[in-house]
Interface confidence: low
């Protein structure tokens, strides 16, 4: 048994006569043989659930659900109730109505086994019938809404008549009807004005009925019509088995370059026309089990369940449903030597589904784990300026497909064939598993015998120690020019284009800093700044070379304070800045300020 509403509303007036009928509460059956029996809670409650007093005024007919006044509520009783309401004015009281058999303990009042009946209290006697407006003669102040469980026996869930009005104003004729589309499952009995379902409802066909209740009032020669919404929501039960959309129960996947823990290898989607169990319970009640295969597969993969509500069209209206994505995920990094093919099965169980049939599906994942071979091109040829400063990035080496790698740890090393010409260094980029070549020794660059540098690049997979090799030929070009006196170590210090471009700084491939002119659009990623190379700095990312020395690119790497209009980078540097940003790495400070106007004519006039 369950209530068709969680709350009912009616008006109460001072000195309303004992025996006045107030309203009906309605219960619907979960099974055909059930017979409802109603029971009132012992107490009246006020604002903020304050227990006011034992209920001595209102009674219920246990079999019909009719609430009526057992005795009149007079001024003094109301005053006493008001005093107990924690000092708040007492405008509304409520009672709890329970469906027997339920526990006789009057605890929380939760639908479906309990409903609240709210009474708006008027500190006057019942108004004269002639003064009541049609709206007051027809409907309660609060619009009702109804909840009906799907697949349950049909029954009466509402009674239109306002009982106190009918009781006290017998000469006013009030008629009701429901405006509804063809074939809807509701009827309003013309004599009793009871609204009932004609048959069991199916939520998967229709979830909401937006009906309209029409009330016609006849008082003497006067006839008026009042219309109010009459919404019915169909509540779901787990009556739909999970299915495969388009019959797809198998996903095939190849694990090759993406071998990192938490990589999603494949996804299978399961559709369930139901929206129960609710989200809080869903993962506990909608289980997925990776069926025991070999131990390796059990350790290597896990299944993640990602449920999402969706809408599907049914009979011209949209109803909610659930899609469950089951993701096969790598549980650990896979070695590049791993090479196997397997079928994994996942048992999905909608444990609340009662049938007919089974609420169980078997998902199949066909997974091929391919080995990865390390290959480098036979030769790399690069050039470097003799003026390049330390940490200048001059190129990249990359094993085949390295941009696609994840979970593969490749380290690059350089072996120099000329002992005194170890000009370059290499560091591995965590982002794309490439090796970034940079100038490590500027003195060696200037030696005439180091005009051509020969290296062997060795790429090693850290887990398996597998290697690949390539020749690296570096040509040193141009002539060395000594640094201007008084230039800072970091390009980022310079605030103006002129001073920027006449100096070099750490990380500069040409021996000169480069000016990046911003777009001047407020706080922008494209702020003006001085950089060793605008290809790499600033780009919103502190790369593995830039981490070697804070002076290279503090715009990307500084962890200190940034003064002025800016948006901080995650986790460091300047993501966006206002005007021009310059930095003082030693002081761990950057400043973003409006662009300077450097017009000489203006300078003259301003004097």
């Amino acid at each position: 048994l369950y209530f068709s509403r969680d709350a009912y509303w009616e008006k109460l007036y001072v000195d309303q006569a004992a025996g006045t009928p107030l309203l009906y509460v309605h219960a619907l059956r979960d099974a055909p043989e059930e017979v409802p029996s109603f029971r009132l809670g012992q107490h009246l409650y006020g604002t903020y659930r304050t227990r006011l007093h034992e209920n001595n005024w209102i009674c219920i007919q246990e079999d019909t659900g009719l609430l009526y006044l057992n005795r009149s509520l007079d001024h003094s009783s109301w005053e006493k109730l008001s005093v107990r309401n924690r000092g708040f004015p007492l405008l509304t009281v409520y009672l709890k109505v329970f469906l027997s058999p339920t526990s006789l303990r009057e605890g929380e009042c939760q639908w479906p086994g309990c409903a609240r009946v709210y009474f708006s209290f008027f500190n006057t006697s019942f108004p004269a019938c002639s003064s009541l407006k049609p709206r007051e003669l027809c409907f309660p102040e609060t619009r009702p809404s109804f909840r009906i469980r799907e697949n349950r026996p049909p029954g009466t869930f509402h009674q239109f008549r306002l009982l106190p009005v009918q009781f006290l104003c017998p000469n006013i004729s009030v008629a009701y009807r429901l405006l509804e589309g063809e074939g809807l499952p509701f009827r309003c009995a013309p004599d009793s004005l009871e609204v009932s379902t004609r048959w069991a409802l199916d939520r998967e066909q229709r979830e909401k009925y937006e009906l309209v209740a029409v009330c016609t009032v006849h008082a003497g020669a006067r006839e008026e019509v009042v219309m109010v919404p009459f919404p019915v929501t169909v509540y779901d039960e787990d009556d739909s088995a999970p299915t495969f959309p388009a019959g797809v129960d198998t996903a095939s996947a190849v694990v090759e370059f993406k071998r990192k823990e938490d990589t999603v290898v494949a996804t299978l989607r399961v559709f369930d026309a139901d929206v129960v169990p609710a989200s809080g319970e869903l993962v506990r009640r909608y289980t997925s089990t990776l069926l025991p295969g070999d131990t390796w597969a059990q350790q290597t993969f896990r299944v993640e369940h990602w449920p999402n509500e969706t809408s599907v069209q049914a009979n011209g209206s949209f109803v909610r449903a659930t899609v469950h994505d089951y993701r096969l995920v790598l549980n650990r990094n896979l070695s590049i030597s791993e090479n196997r093919t397997m079928q994994l099965a996942v048992l999905v169980n909608d444990s609340d589904f009662q049938g007919p049939g089974a609420g169980v599906l078997l998902l199949h994942f066909n997974v091929s784990v391919l080995p990865v071979s390390l290959h480098l091109p036979s030769t790399y040829s690069l050039s470097v300026s003799r003026r390049a400063r330390r940490f200048a990035q001059i190129g990249k080496v990359c094993v085949e497909n390295c941009q696609a790698f994840s979970g593969i740890n490749v380290q690059y090393k350089l072996h120099s064939s000329g002992a005194n010409c170890s000009t370059l260094g290499v560091v591995t980029s965590a982002e794309d598993t490439s090796g970034i070549l940079f100038v490590n020794d500027t003195k060696a660059l200037r030696r005439p015998k180091c005009a051509e540098l020969h290296y062997m690049v060795v790429a090693t997979d850290q887990q398996t120690s597998r290697q690949a090799q390539a020749q690296l030929l570096v040509t040193v070009e141009g002539s060395y020019v000594a640094e201007e006196a008084g230039c800072p170590l970091s390009c980022a210090v310079s605030k103006r284009r002129l001073e920027c471009e006449e100096c070099g700084g750490l990380g500069s491939p040409t021996g000169r800093c480069e000016w990046r002119q911003g777009d001047g659009k407020g706080i922008t990623r494209n702020f003006s700044t001085c950089s060793p190379s605008t290809k790499t700095c600033p780009d919103g990312h502190c790369d593995v070379v830039e981490t070697q020395d804070i002076n290279i690119c503090p715009q990307d790497c500084l962890r200190g304070s940034i003064v002025g209009g800016h948006e901080p980078g995650e986790p460091r540097g300047i993501k966006a800045g206002y005007g021009t940003c310059n930095c003082f790495p030693e002081e761990e400070k950057c400043f973003c300020e409006p662009e300077d106007i450097q017009d000489p004519l203006c300078d003259e006039l301003c004097r």
Partner: antibody, heavy 118, light 107 residues
């Protein structure tokens, strides 16, 4: 009660074709993978082919791959095995079996005899 | 494909005897192995699945053990109705395969 009833077995010439059917009842057919197993006279059991619950995935023994096709019609609760290019070594009793969720075969039909001979 | 080899191929024993049949897999099949009995003229029936779980309705004198590549089926006290061929089957990966069978005969 779970029941599996095979039909379609016959005497057929080498190179010929035959279609076996297996009518299922007593369980929700569309929820279970199904399989065909055969047994040559006086020999052991040989797994022939399997199909997933929806029919989206099919699996075959190497000895029949490219010649046999497994399929199912969930609306008719029926499993099929289309056998083409039949050879003398395909002579056997063919059983259809229901797979449990964990893969093993918990219910079997009574079998249907296929004889390939000239 | 995974090959299963049963030993012995033939076994003579008497009522009341304890007998053991072994099944070797050519590669790791975890515990994904089942044992079937086939009475003459009938379809096989499953005795043990998941290497050691007794199928409901099967007498407790049957038991299974093992994992990985070596598995055994033990009948603790032979009954007259137990004389039949027995097959192991791996369900670890497709194609599923059966052992060649062990024929248990009355001595």
């Amino acid at each position: 009660e779970v029941q599996l009833v095979e039909s379609g077995g016959a005497l057929v010439q080498p190179g010929g074709s035959l279609r076996l059917s297996c009518a299922a009842s007593g369980f929700t057919f569309s929820n279970y993978a199904m399989t065909w197993v055969r047994q040559a006279p006086g020999m052991g059991l040989e797994w022939v082919s399997g199909i997933s619950s929806s029919g989206a995935s099919t699996f075959y023994a190497d000895s029949v791959k490219g010649r046999f096709t497994i399929s199912r019609d969930n609306s008719k609760n029926t499993l099929y095995l289309q056998m083409n290019s039949l050879r003398a070594e395909d002579t056997a009793v063919y059983y259809c079996a229901k797979e449990d969720y964990w893969g093993w075969f918990d219910y079997w039909g009574q079998g249907t005899l296929v004889t390939v001979s000239s | 494909d995974i090959q299963l080899t049963q030993s012995p191929s033939f076994l003579s024993a008497s009522v009341g005897d304890r007998v053991t049949i072994t099944c070797w897999a050519s590669q790791d099949v975890s515990s994904y192995l089942a044992w079937y009995q086939q009475e003459p003229g009938k379809a096989p029936k499953v005795l043990i699945y998941d290497a050691s779980t007794l199928q409901s309705g099967v007498p407790s004198r049957f038991s299974g053990s093992g994992s990985g590549t070596e598995f055994t089926l033990t009948i603790s006290s032979l009954q007259p109705e137990d004389f039949a061929p027995y097959y192991c089957q791996q369900l670890n990966s497709y194609p599923y395969t059966f052992g060649q069978g062990t024929k248990l005969e009355i001595k």
